[in-house]
């Protein structure tokens, strides 16, 4: 057992048929020694007597909030949450696996630049009863320190007869350098509790890995005198670093017919313009990624080739 | 050239050959062996690898003041990476795949290390450590690992000679 | 299996230019380096360029600098080497093959014929 | 560029018996060379990388040896399938060079 906040306990418990439990002691936070009583959640049955209960843990019935009273005025509570370990495994009940980009994904996290700056996002198909509470630091032997805000209710989507919750949080690093190489990972840990079930997540990466640049800002196309021909241009997104003379960016574009079958001409390049040839109905798109590191594309940037 | 008295060094070519090495770093990673092996073990297996630190003086304010220290700092990098390709972690069993790039990245690395430092001048290298494993998984699982680092040791090499190219050339 | 088949014969006429492909199946296109070599009847094999799917970067032996662009369309695994302002110095067999250290696979070749 | 000078520019031998193909290199190239066979109207095909490295399938009569500059190709025990054209190649820095080839033919 262990204290995950005030007054609040998680038991960790081994999940099986049979299995015999834990033993909990919990003690009446009061100067009083005599006429203490026990009672657990909303019911009035006396569990025991004395400033210290003693009860054994074997499942969800036996978690909730125990209370000591004394002549009818509460003296303390203590919570307690059950940690359901199965076959050696933790349970993973509460949230969703993701699945991308690898099984047993439950959080995801992207950066737009290389500021600190980092948003981490997990779904779960609970829409009550639920809590959240996110740590972060750089490191783990030493960590140095990350300041995330509070988990909130990002999006609600309907998949098939489910409703699907998202929940995200941002993160920013304390001393973020990011000109620098990063040597340890930044660390994520989540506690979710969903009524007296606990659970932990967490998630391990560099911010270079989760960089994904705003796709291109003002795309635009400059039809070329007696040519099929168009200049494109765009700019960068104002979210990324700067100077862009050291965090650049290389651009994908792309011309695309109106059938996903017709060949997608694509042109690579360094620059903020690029000259192709629109097709009728066709459209073109511009997308970013870091210039030296391969982390994630943006998401594409369009306009109509007409 | 970036020469140990302090002139500068070929900020273009330094930036095309590095620009050439993130690429190389890239296209060598998945060709290293025949083992599908992920990230795995602890993080400690390359940490004693040289990583371009917060107070090397490689972010652009840096660069400005003196780019001499970061400099120095790249050049220990390339010849630390180089002389781990060359070493028995890469030559060793299991053999690289054919299609491998490895032999490209080594000859970049040098390449790269002797634009930073022409013969006859000397900066300081850092020790190389003695990472030899014995089994051939651990030198296929070392191999990710150095070349992921590798990768992200280039891409801030790579920004600071495009960052010297634009604002520092004479 | 891994497999390159490259585009038929091509019967051209000087200064002309030609595009020649290389079909890529069996294996993860973007991952690999694609390799292009030029063959004159009864010689030596000669490096013209590579190209890395994933980001388009390419490279050129000085030497065709300007004769051969190297190009992929990663939507259908292809790799493409355009010859430009041909001669009959041109006229030889091509081919790719995949990787940027040993070539392990190959193309059938391609043979370019520059003739009036 | 690397030179790569390949020798004999031409070899004749019966079958069984042992042939050995050497290349040297301009620089040193570490063990950065592939070997390949190529007949008549065909692609080539590789034998050997890495300078050691049997490729998939490749008989084990063949072998390659040598590190730097100086490498060769052993061929024992000689088959009449084992006749054509041998070359090396180097795939140290861009560009890579070839050597210009070894005609081995039957006796």
């Known amino acids: 057992i262990w204290e995950l906040k005030k007054d609040v306990y998680v038991v960790e418990l081994d999940w099986y048929p049979d299995a015999p439990g834990e033993m909990v002691v919990l003690t009446c936070d009061t100067p009083e020694e005599d006429g203490i009583t026990w009672t657990l959640d909303q019911s009035s049955e006396v569990l025991g007597s004395g400033k210290t209960l003693t009860i054994q843990v074997k499942e969800f019935g036996d978690a909730g909030q125990y209370t000591c009273h004394k002549g009818g005025e509460v003296l303390s509570h203590s919570l307690l949450l059950l940690h359901k370990k199965e076959d050696g495994i933790w349970s993973t009940d509460i949230l969703k696996d993701q699945k991308e980009p690898k099984n047993k994904t439950f959080l995801r996290c992207e950066a737009k630049n290389y500021s600190g700056r980092f948003t981490c996002w997990w779904l779960t198909t609970i829409s009550t009863d639920l809590t959240f509470s996110v740590k972060s630091s750089r490191g783990s032997s030493d960590p140095q320190g990350v300041t995330c805000g509070a988990a909130t209710l990002s999006a609600e989507r309907v998949r098939g007869d489910n409703k699907e919750y998202e929940y995200s949080v941002e993160c920013q690093e304390d001393s973020a350098c990011p000109a620098a190489e990063e040597s340890l990972p930044i660390e994520v840990m989540v506690d979710a509790v969903h009524k007296l079930k606990y659970e932990n997540y967490t998630s391990s990466f560099f911010i270079r890995d989760i960089i994904k640049p705003d796709p291109p800002k003002n795309l635009q196309l400059k039809p070329l005198k007696n040519s099929r021909q168009v200049e494109v241009s765009w700019e960068y997104p104002d979210t990324w670093s700067t100077p862009h003379s050291y965090f650049s960016l290389t651009f994908c574009v792309q011309v695309q017919g109106k059938s996903k079958r017709e060949k997608k001409d694509r042109v690579f390049t360094d620059k903020t313009s690029a000259t192709v040839i629109c097709r009728k109905n066709a459209s073109i798109s511009v997308r970013a990624q870091d210039r030296y590191y391969s982390s994630s594309w943006s998401e594409w940037a369009s306009v109509p080739c007409s | 050239r970036a020469v140990p008295g302090g002139s500068s060094p070929a900020w273009t070519q330094c930036q095309q050959l590095s620009q050439k090495l993130c690429t190389l770093a890239w296209s060598a990673h998945p060709l290293v062996g025949h083992m599908d092996l992920r990230e795995e073990g602890d993080e400690e297996t390359t940490n004693d690898v040289p990583h371009i630190q917060c107070g090397d003086g490689c972010d652009p304010q840096g660069l400005r003041d003196n780019s001499q220290f970061c400099l120095q700092r790249i050049h220990q990098g390339l010849i630390f990476y180089e002389k781990l390709l060359g070493s028995d972690i890469f030559t060793g069993e299991p053999s690289l795949l054919p299609d491998s790039p490895v032999g490209q990245l080594h000859a970049s690395l040098l390449g790269l290390s002797q634009l930073l430092q022409p013969e006859g001048h000397h900066w300081e290298t850092q020790q190389i450590p003695s990472l030899s494993p014995s089994q051939p998984w651990q030198r296929l699982l070392l191999r990710f690992k150095i070349l992921r680092s590798l990768q992200a040791f280039v891409a801030v090499a790579a920004r600071v000679f495009a960052h010297g190219a634009a604002t520092l050339s004479p | 299996h891994v497999q390159l088949q490259q585009s038929g014969p091509e019967l051209v006429r000087p200064g002309a230019s030609v595009e020649l492909s290389c079909k890529a199946s069996?294996?993860?296109?973007?991952?690999?380096?694609m390799t292009w070599m030029k063959q004159r009847p009864g010689q030596g094999l000669e490096w013209i360029g590579q190209?890395?799917?994933?980001?388009?970067?390419?490279d050129y032996n000085e030497m065709f600098e300007g004769k051969a662009t190297l190009t992929v369309d990663t939507s259908s695994n292809t790799a493409y080497m355009q010859l430009s302002s041909l001669t009959s110095e041109d006229s030889a067999v091509y081919f790719c093959?995949?990787?940027?250290?040993?070539?392990?696979?190959w193309g059938q070749g391609t043979l370019v014929t520059v003739s009036a | 560029d690397i030179q790569m000078t390949q020798s004999p520019a031409s070899l004749s031998a019966s079958v069984g018996e042992t042939v050995t193909i050497t290349c040297r290199t301009s620089e040193n190239i570490y063990s950065y060379l592939a070997w390949y066979q190529q007949k008549q109207g065909k692609s080539p095909q590789l034998l050997v990388y890495n300078a050691k490295t049997l490729a998939e399938g490749v008989p084990s009569r063949f072998s390659g040896s040598g590190s730097g500059t100086q490498f060769s190709l052993k061929i024992n025990r000689l088959q009449p399938e084992d006749f054509g054209r041998y070359f090396c190649?180097?795939?140290?820095?861009?560009?890579?060079?070839f050597g210009s080839g070894t005609k081995l033919e039957i006796k």
């Open positions: 069996g294996y993860i296109f973007i991952t690999y380096w």
């Open positions: 190649q180097h795939h140290y820095g861009i560009p890579f060079t």
């Open positions: 093959a995949r990787g940027g250290g040993g070539f392990a696979y």
């Open positions: 190209i890395f799917p994933a980001s388009g970067s390419a």
